[in-house]
C-alpha cells in the first residue's frame, strides 16, 4: 500500500490521543533504554509502511501483535486516514487471524514495539534530519 | 478542483428504469468508497447504496435492494447506479457522494450537484 | 437499524448569538477500534449538503472553527459558537457504523 495520500496530520493526532499510551501500557514495566532502535524510516509515507509492516506482520518470536489494541486503532487510524487502506488489508486480516494462535507479550515482541515507538516519534517530526 | 457531476435523470413511468451516472474529477478515484444517497421532495436524506474503491463490497438500502444496481468502472472515473422497477416513492434528487467506505470514517466528504428522478405516470 | 433523532426540529438563532443541536442514536457508534461513527452535514437552501464533522468532532476541510462537534456513545451534539448569516440550512446527522446508514431527521437553523 502506498501511503504518500494519507492525512498525515490526523494520523498524527490520533497517535498522541491514543495509540501512544497504547504502546506505553503495552511496554508498561520495562526501561526506556533496554531496546536500541535499529528500525528507522525517512519521511512519513515511509513510516507509516514500517509501522504497517512492525505491527501487523508476525515476525519470529513474535506472531501477536495485531490483536493488540494499539494495534487494532492503529489499523482504524490508516483506515479512517488513508483512502483505500482498509480493503487492500482485507485478505492480510484474515490470513492474520488463521496465523494467530494466543496472545503472548515474549521479550522478542516487546523489543519489537520498542522499535514501533521510535518509528511513531520520527513520524511526529518529519522535517527533523535523520542522525 | 475535486468535483463530482451526476447526469442521466428525468421523468420515468412506474415499473421503468433508468441509469445515472457520476463523473469525477480532481482526485485519484479509484482511491475511494462511494456511495449514493437522495433527497425525496421536502425531505430528508437517506442512503441508497455504497461501493468500496475496488468493487470488492457493495451495500444496499432495504427499500433499493434488488431493484438497484451500484457500480463503478475506475478506468473512466465514473460511477453508476441502474434503477430497475422504479416506483412513485423512488422520486428525489440523488447525489453522487464521495466516502461511504472506511475513509474519514464512511462520512461523505465531496457531494455532487444532484440530479431528479421523478417517477409519474 | 440504528435509528438517528434530531432535537430540535428547528432553531431560530439571532446572529452572534450560540446554537446546539442533538443528535441521538438508538445503539451506540463506538467501533471496537475506539473510533465513534457520526457525522454531521449542513444543507444550505438549494444547494447540495456538505461535510461539516467527521468521527463525532473532527472539522472537515476548510469548516469554520465556530463549528465544533462532541459526544459519545449515544449522545452527540453540534455547536455553532457564533451563528453567522451563512449558517442557515439543514443540519444532518448520520451513522456509518453498520449498513444501512441512517441519517436524522434533521435540524432547520434560521436567523432571527
Known amino acids: 500500500y502506498d501511503f504518500t495520500n494519507c492525512d498525515f496530520e490526523k494520523i498524527k493526532a490520533a497517535y498522541l490521543s491514543t495509540i501512544s499510551k497504547d504502546l506505553i501500557t503495552y511496554m508498561s514495566g520495562t526501561k526506556s533504554t533496554e531496546f536500541n532502535n535499529t528500525v528507522s524510516c525517512s519521511n512519513r509515507p515511509h513510516c507509516l509502511t514500517e509501522i504497517q509492516s512492525l505491527t501487523f506482520n508476525p515476525t519470529a518470536g513474535c506472531a501477536s501483535l495485531a490483536k493488540e489494541m494499539f494495534a487494532m486503532k492503529t489499523k482504524a487510524a490508516l483506515a479512517i486516514w488513508c483512502p483505500g487502506y482498509s480493503e487492500t488489508q482485507i485478505n492480510a486480516t484474515q490470513a492474520m487471524k488463521k496465523a494467530r494462535k494466543s496472545k503472548v507479550t515474549t521479550n522478542k515482541c516487546l523489543e519489537q514495539v520498542s522499535q514501533l515507538q521510535g518509528l511513531w516519534r520520527r513520524f511526529n517530526r518529519p522535517l527533523l534530519k535523520q542522525q | 478542483e475535486v468535483q463530482l457531476v451526476e447526469s442521466g435523470g428525468g421523468l420515468v413511468q412506474p415499473g421503468g428504469s433508468l441509469r445515472l451516472s457520476c463523473a469525477a474529477s480532481?482526485?485519484?478515484?479509484?482511491?475511494?468508497?462511494m456511495t449514493w444517497v437522495r433527497q425525496a421532495p421536502g425531505k430528508g436524506l437517506e442512503w441508497v447504496s455504497s461501493?468500496?474503491?475496488?468493487?470488492?463490497?457493495?451495500y444496499y438500502a432495504d427499500s433499493v435492494k434488488g431493484r438497484f444496481t451500484i457500480s463503478r468502472d475506475n478506468a473512466k472515473n465514473s460511477l453508476s447506479l441502474q434503477m430497475n422497477s422504479l416506483r412513485a416513492e423512488d422520486t428525489a434528487v440523488y447525489y453522487c457522494?464521495?466516502?461511504?467506505?472506511?475513509?474519514?470514517?464512511?462520512?461523505?466528504?465531496?457531494w455532487g450537484q444532484g440530479v431528479l428522478v421523478t417517477v409519474s405516470s | 437499524d440504528i435509528v438517528m433523532t434530531q432535537t430540535p426540529l428547528s432553531l431560530s438563532v439571532t446572529p452572534g448569538e450560540p446554537a446546539s443541536i442533538s443528535c441521538r442514536s438508538s445503539?451506540?457508534?463506538?467501533?471496537?477500534?475506539?473510533?465513534?461513527?457520526l457525522h454531521w452535514y449542513l444543507q444550505k437552501p438549494g444547494q447540495s449538503p456538505q461535510l461539516l464533522i467527521y468521527?463525532?468532532?473532527y472539522r472537515a476541510s476548510g469548516v469554520p472553527d465556530r463549528f465544533s462537534g462532541s459526544g459519545s456513545d449515544t449522545d452527540f451534539t453540534l455547536k455553532i459558537s457564533r451563528v453567522e448569516a451563512e449558517d442557515v440550512g439543514v443540519y444532518y446527522c448520520?451513522?456509518?457504523?453498520?449498513?444501512?446508514?441512517?441519517f436524522g431527521g434533521g435540524t432547520k437553523v434560521e436567523i432571527k
Open positions: 461501493i468500496t474503491f475496488a468493487s470488492s463490497y457493495i
Open positions: 468521527l463525532v468532532s
Open positions: 445503539q451506540s457508534l463506538l467501533h471496537s477500534y475506539g473510533y465513534t461513527y
Open positions: 457522494t464521495r466516502g461511504g467506505g472506511a475513509y474519514y470514517g464512511g462520512s461523505l466528504d465531496v
Open positions: 448520520e451513522q456509518t457504523l453498520q449498513t444501512p446508514y441512517t
Open positions: 480532481g482526485f485519484t478515484f479509484s482511491n475511494y468508497g
